[in-house]
């Protein structure tokens, strides 16, 4: 059998990607077509795909740390570490590396797609039209301060998050991980991993900014993808924080 | 102890980064605020950070080749290679790989931050303002030949320099370096390394272009970061060139 | 001897790069200078180089899979797999990994150069001039639908092709390939490799779009580089498809 450890992560990634693709297609392409006959099919190759990629990436990254949370809760519930985990959890725990690498793969793709935005003809033509409109409106200054801040911050956090994820990926190369002590490897994978999940989540939240309360975002009463995307990471981070509290931390270390 | 060989490089990188950050903050944000109440805090997440990254990267890369220069000078002074190096130099020589990898890490970050420039809202809004102003001035052609040349050259050199640095990084992967003969590995690390330092330095100098004599660059009588950044690399390259002269080269090879 | 397996691939890459560079220089720089005294020398560092890189990349990638095609034809002709291949084919077969890695190296450079386009001053000044002209012409909408589609598709395909090529490159790291079964490694290198060649070729063809019949593209009666670039990949893909036909496939498997 080819790539046995990759089956589950690839299946999950494919399911999330397909669902997100259809969902985004509905909101970004089908809705404008149905409601005002606007043809936005050109958005599919890049803009729609680039809504799918971060969704898959952050979800897969959350799925790297979620089994650890569940395992800790199971151990706390059982009061011992010697009781065997359920089979599905065991299987999941063993494929965390693959989930993480897939998450990195999608994150890199998301970065490249994002960096390609300003080189596209569609962006160029939009810019020229905006410039034309600005002249027509006799508007000297296009600057929107809060929008500038929003983008400077989320782009910067996204890059740093990707950089940390890259460190995790590099240390997953067999010969690199072999050159590290178990403690060093564990330190990178656990500490830096959670930091990258945190940065990715903040990146998504700052991307969202004030869109949470913008009624225009709720197309056909559906929430924008970023709202769905941050749900699982936020849950994982909350549980990680709770398990990090001194009282629970002592209990887990005892077990 | 975790990552013992990484302590020195990370400490040095953190010190350079912190100092450059504060220095750039002073020049780019504090100065306009203090002198004319201009709020440029939005520059911190990307523009200020992206002055720090190349500074750290090129300095760390210079610090990979500086101990070799010092070692050669020490050997020439001693007239023998059997006399032990001072402890600090020995320690430094053993962490060159880490310095190099950190330099590459910061260079990649610098590249990504730079590539993100045109996708930022701040850049879009500025572009729209420039377009409006060009129409207002009835200026048919915005082209500034020397400025175009400057950027085409420094961007191209930067990419090539980064590509060579990437080759060095890849050959540092244990299983890759193991598949090379010692001569092959040494060839890549020494020859290509110096080429990448040279390209990085020229990249910085062409970025500087005519800014050396532009009085506006000297904010509160402080030189711009690129002037400080190129100092160490230029020193290393000069000494490398001197030690490459036939007379000295023969002496070193004899030793 | 340093890097014996890299000699042939580097030589071939250098020859293709030099010829493409001179060819592009002739078409993009010399021709406008000779015919209408337009100085386009500024195009050399990025625009000319970035015509060379994809040409070299896709040709090298085609040269990874061409020897396999030739070997299959030779075996079909001989009716046996026990007859020795000619020395040149043998040598070529043994350097396919190097051809592939070089192809990936040039593809990554092509991607970075392409992503750097909108950050260049030349692009900024052109944009501003276009905006000025649009206002002067009182043209409300700059949008060209087919041009938008063309770029959205070819950029997207290019990124996906590069991503697959990256997977091939990663699995070429000795410790990574050692961790895979032979079947897994072969699956990635053969199946994914051909997919990336296919995507790269479609990327080039969609970049070409309607330029095949645009007389302006034939400068001094010379075809544009993409026409030359896609020739070899198309030949390889056609032969691969033919050899994939059930009748021939059975014969090859028998042998």
């Amino acid at each position: 059998e080819l790539f046995p450890q990759w089956h589950l992560p690839i299946k999950i990634a494919a399911i999330i990607a397909s669902l997100t693709f259809l969902y985004t297609l509905l909101r970004e392409v089908i809705h404008p077509l149905a409601t005002s006959h606007q043809q936005y099919f050109y958005k599919i190759p890049i803009l729609v795909i680039n809504k799918v990629l971060p969704m898959v990436s952050i979800t897969l990254l959350a799925l790297v740390y979620l089994p650890g949370v569940i395992a800790a809760i199971v151990q706390l519930h059982n009061g011992t570490k010697y009781k065997k985990f359920p089979h599905w959890l065991d299987k999941w725990m063993l494929t965390r590396k693959q989930f993480g690498l897939l998450s990195f793969f999608f994150a890199v793709l998301h970065a490249i797609y994002s960096l390609s935005y300003p080189m596209r003809r569609s962006y160029r033509y939009k810019l020229l039209n905006w410039a034309y409109q600005q002249v027509q409106q006799n508007k000297e200054d296009a600057w929107i301060e809060h929008d500038v801040w929003r983008m400077e911050i989320y782009v910067s956090l996204g890059i740093v998050g990707l950089a940390i994820l890259a460190l995790l990926a590099v240390t997953s190369i067999p010969s690199v991980s072999d050159s590290l002590t178990w403690r060093e490897f564990h330190y990178i994978q656990s500490k830096l991993g959670i930091v990258s999940l945190l940065l990715g989540t903040i990146h998504a939240l700052i991307f969202a900014w004030n869109k949470w309360i913008d009624i225009k975002q709720f197309v056909w009463y559906t929430p924008p993808t970023f709202m769905i995307a941050v749900f699982l990471p936020v849950v994982v981070l909350i549980f990680k924080s709770i398990l990090f509290l001194p009282c629970l931390r002592k209990k887990i270390l005892k077990i | 102890e975790l990552f013992p060989q990484w302590h020195l490089p990370i400490k040095i990188a953190a010190i350079i980064a912190s100092l450059t950050f504060l220095y750039t903050l002073l020049r780019e944000v504090i100065h306009p605020l203090a002198t004319s109440h201009q709020q440029y805090f939005y520059k911190i997440p990307i523009l200020v950070i992206n002055k720090v990254l190349p500074m750290v990267s090129i300095t760390l890369l210079a610090l990979v080749y500086l101990p070799g220069v010092i070692a050669a000078i020490v050997q020439l002074h001693n007239g023998t290679k059997y006399k032990k190096f001072p402890h600090w130099l020995d320690k430094w020589m053993l962490t060159r790989k880490q310095f190099g990898l950190l330099s590459f890490f910061f260079a990649v970050l610098h590249a990504i931050y730079s590539l993100s420039y045109p996708m930022r809202r701040s850049y879009r809004y500025k572009l729209l303002n420039w377009a409006y102003q060009q129409v207002q001035q009835n200026k048919e052609d915005a082209w500034i030949e020397h400025d175009v040349w400057r950027m085409e050259i420094y961007v191209s050199l930067g990419i090539v320099g980064l590509a060579i640095l990437a080759l060095l990084a890849v050959t540092s992967i244990p299983s890759v370096s193991d598949s090379l003969t010692w001569r092959e590995f040494h060839y890549i690390q020494s020859k290509l390394g110096i080429v990448s330092l040279l390209l990085g330095t020229i990249h910085a100098l062409i970025f500087a272009w005519n800014k050396w004599i532009d009085i506006k660059q000297f904010v509160w009588y402080t030189p711009p970061t690129f002037m400080i950044a190129v100092f160490l690399p230029v020193v290393v390259l000069i000494f490398k060139s001197i030690l490459f002269l036939p007379c000295l080269r023969k002496k070193i090879l004899k030793i | 001897e340093l890097f014996p397996q890299w000699h042939l691939p580097i030589k071939i890459a250098a020859i293709i790069a030099s010829l493409t560079f001179l060819y592009t220089l002739l078409r993009e720089v010399i021709h406008p200078l000779a015919t209408s005294h337009q100085q386009y020398f500024y195009k050399i560092p990025i625009l000319v180089i970035n015509k060379v890189l994809p040409m070299v990349s896709i040709t090298l990638l085609a040269l990874v899979y061409l020897p396999g095609v030739i070997a299959a034809i030779v075996q079909l002709h001989n009716g046996t797999k026990y007859k020795k291949f000619p020395h040149w084919l043998d040598k070529w077969m043994l350097t396919r990994k190097q051809f592939g890695l070089l192809s990936f190296f040039f593809a990554v450079l092509h991607a970075i150069y392409s992503l750097s386009y909108p950050m260049r001053r030349s692009y900024r000044y052109k944009l501003l001039n276009w905006a000025y002209q649009q206002v002067q012409q009182n043209k409300e909408d700059a949008w060209i639908e087919h041009d938008v589609w063309r770029m959205e598709i070819y950029v997207s395909l290019g990124i996906v092709g590069l991503a697959i090529l990256a997977l091939l490159a990663v699995t070429s790291i000795p410790s990574v390939s050692d961790s895979l079964t032979w079947r897994e490694f072969h699956y990635i290198q053969s199946k994914l490799g051909i997919v990336s060649l296919l995507l790269g070729t479609i990327h080039a063809l969609i970049f070409a779009w309607n330029k095949w019949i645009d007389i302006k593209q034939f400068v001094w009666y010379t075809p544009p580089t993409f026409m030359i670039a896609v020739f070899l990949p198309v030949v390889v893909l056609i032969f691969k498809s033919i050899l994939f036909l059930p009748c021939l496939r059975k014969k090859i498997l028998k042998i």
Partner: antibody
Framework: EVQLVESGGGLVQPGGSLRLSCAVS?????????WNWVRQAPGKGLEWVGY???????SYNPSLKSRFTISRDNSKNTLYLQMNSLRAEDTAVYYC?????????????????WGQGTLVTVSS | DIQMTQSPSSLSASVGDRVTITCKSS????????????LAWYQQKPGKAPKLLIY???TRESGVPSRFSGSGSGTDFTLTISSLQPEDFATYYC?????????FGQGTKVEIK
């Protein structure tokens, strides 16, 4: 030291034409500065007429209804203001003034050097 | 066009007095993208050409005495002479260079009391 010296003023009939010159010394007009014409009617305030940039592009006050044209002679390092279809309300002292050329960081600049002015009288 | 309104149109003051001239624009002169206010102040003495005192609303031109200061942002600006000197009796103009056409205030004449 930069010096701007205007000349060519005088008495002109309504409907007539006049060409004012501004000789610049100590600085090249094709260097990184733009050159403005500003006028001041007797006992009145200042009014901007138009400008020519170092690259040669021009912009005018729309109120002048394209009666005025700014040009330059690079070899003489001199700017010109060609005034056609002159009216009584064009009577003023005409100044030429220098401002730093537009740049992409600071955009526009104020007029830092002015000539002593030349008087144009439009009267029958 | 941007309208510039100066007040007062004239004022009488003595040597050593603190003098304040205000200038209002019909729209904001602040470019948010570079946080600069595109307003200049000029001094003109009878029969002479205007002289630049302040640019970007608050930056003193080199050689201008420190008693001259500019302040304000957006649409409201002020020129202050902290201690009036005999040579300061002149007409002062504000000017916007935020867009074209450039426009000036009608001027404020500072006379000896």
């Amino acid at each position: 030291e930069v010096q701007l010296v205007e000349s060519g003023g005088g008495l002109v009939q309504p409907g007539g034409s006049l060409r004012l010159s501004c000789a610049v010394s100590g600085y090249s007009i094709t260097s990184d500065y733009a050159w403005n014409w500003v006028r001041q009617a007797p006992g009145k305030g200042l009014e901007w007429v138009g400008y020519i940039s170092n690259s040669g592009s021009t912009s005018y006050n729309p109120s002048l209804k394209s009666r005025f044209t700014i040009s330059r002679d690079n070899s003489k390092n001199t700017l010109y203001l060609q005034m056609n279809s002159l009216r009584a309300e064009d009577t003023a002292v005409y100044y030429c003034a220098r401002e730093r050329n537009y740049d992409y960081d600071d955009y526009y600049y104020a007029m830092d050097y002015w000539g002593q002015g030349t008087l144009v009288t439009v009267s029958s | 066009d941007i309208q510039m309104t100066q007040s007062p149109s004239s004022l009488s003051a003595s040597v050593g007095d603190r003098v304040t001239i205000t200038c209002k624009s019909s729209q904001s002169l602040l470019y948010r993208s570079n946080q600069k206010n595109y307003l200049a102040w000029y001094q003109q003495k009878p029969g002479k050409a205007p002289k630049l005192l302040i640019y970007w609303a608050s930056t003193r031109e080199s050689g201008v005495p420190s008693r001259f200061s500019g302040s304000g942002s957006g649409t409201d600006f002020t020129l202050t002479i902290s201690s009036l000197q005999p040579e300061d009796f002149a007409t002062y103009y504000c000017q916007q260079y935020y867009n074209y056409p450039r426009t000036f205030g009608q001027g404020t004449k500072v006379e000896i009391k």
